[in-house]
């Protein structure tokens, strides 16, 4: 049985204020059944960055087409970056539960930091 791997290839992503940042996340299996969500930070105080199923995330778009079948690319773009966006971002696989989904596996995280302003 193939064990699910959550792949976030960049450990560090340098971004520019006002620009768009792309956070990459791919998975190696569709299993277990359940959604992938993006968070900033860890623990109970972590911030939900994107949930495709519900919520409103006006600055976030998905890299892959949402009508694509059997998608394994859960990368996102965050537009209009501000200094408040810095932090470590995690894509997290949840296992479907009833009534609540249960966290199954997290990616290693990508730290978003501000790079030098272009001159």
């Amino acid at each position: 049985e193939e064990e699910l791997q959550m792949i976030q290839p960049e450990k560090l992503l340098l971004v520019t204020v006002g620009k768009t940042a792309t956070l990459h996340c791919t998975v190696t299996s569709l299993l277990p059944v359940g959604p992938v969500l993006w968070f900033r930070g860890v623990g109970p105080g972590r911030e939900l960055i994107y949930n495709q199923k519900e919520g409103h995330f006006p600055r976030v778009t998905t890299v892959s087409d949402l009508t694509k079948r059997n998608n394994m690319d859960f990368s996102i773009r965050i537009s209009s970056i501000t200094p408040a966006d810095v932090g470590t971002y995690y894509c997290v696989k949840f296992r479907k539960g009833s009534p609540e989904n249960v966290e199954f596996k997290s990616g290693p995280g990508t730290e978003m930091a501000l790079g030098a302003k272009p001159s």
């Epitope: 569709l30 299993l31 059944v33 009508t67 694509k68 059997n70 998608n71």
Partner: antibody, heavy 120, light 108 residues
């Protein structure tokens, strides 16, 4: 080409047991969820059970009586049916799950079905 | 459990006619609806997923629309091979996956 071939159906008495099998080919079986859907004679479709990796889901009507399992080394899906009742009489279809977007499952390939008749 | 209600239960139509099927959900299911066709003695066949995306190999006379609670499957010009029963299915909130009761398309 995706193929799903069910077997194991037949006539069984109320309270009896039966084990259905579904042999899958033409796709990477181990990374997809798989399901059983049934159809009573002249009736509509009713979802029975789904299995992911080792995560399993059941309709209330079969919970505690039916067990879904899979053998990825054999590309085979199973449904163990115990304590069978007359209302379990149906054609049982094996179906491959497909996802769209970031979650949400439907059934993109179906087997031809195997008939289970529960009768004394 | 989300209940799907399909109407009408039966449609009598002639080849070449435009056919519209309705599927209404008891609560918001976003666009998480699939449509299947089943011919007598055969397994169901996926036609539409995500409310409006045609499956591979499905003719473009089949189209789906709707979101929230009201969904429609349309066959723009019914062909003789299109007769059968059509089911909608929701996958927004499960278990359980639920299906509508089906709409049977008969020859007029």
């Amino acid at each position: 080409e995706v193929q799903l071939v069910e077997s194991g159906g037949g006539v069984v008495q109320p309270g009896g047991s039966l084990r259905l099998s579904c042999a899958a080919s033409g796709f990477s079986f181990s990374i997809y969820a798989m399901s059983w859907v049934r159809q009573a004679p002249g009736k509509g479709l009713e979802w029975v059970s789904t299995i992911g990796a080792d995560d399993t889901y059941y309709a209330d009507s079969v919970k505690g009586r039916f067990t879904i399992s899979r053998d990825n080394s054999k590309n085979t899906l199973y449904l163990q049916m115990n304590s069978l009742r007359a209302e379990d009489t149906a054609v049982y279809y094996c179906a491959k799950d497909s996802t769209v977007g970031w979650s949400g499952d439907f059934f993109d390939y179906w087997g031809q079905g195997t008939l289970v008749t529960v009768s004394s | 459990e989300i209940v799907l209600t399909q109407s009408p239960a039966t449609l009598s139509v002639s080849p070449g006619e435009r056919v519209t099927f309705s599927c209404r959900a008891s609560q918001n299911v976003r666009s998480d609806i699939a449509w299947y066709q089943q011919k007598p003695g055969q397994a169901p066949r996926l036609l539409i997923y995500a409310a409006s995306s045609r499956d591979t190999g499905i003719p473009d006379r089949f189209s789906g629309s709707g979101s929230g609670t009201d969904f429609t499957l349309t066959i723009s010009s019914l062909q003789s091979e299109d007769f059968g029963v059509y089911y909608c299915q929701q996958y927004y909130d499960w278990p359980p996956f639920t299906f509508g009761g089906g709409t049977k398309v008969e020859i007029k």
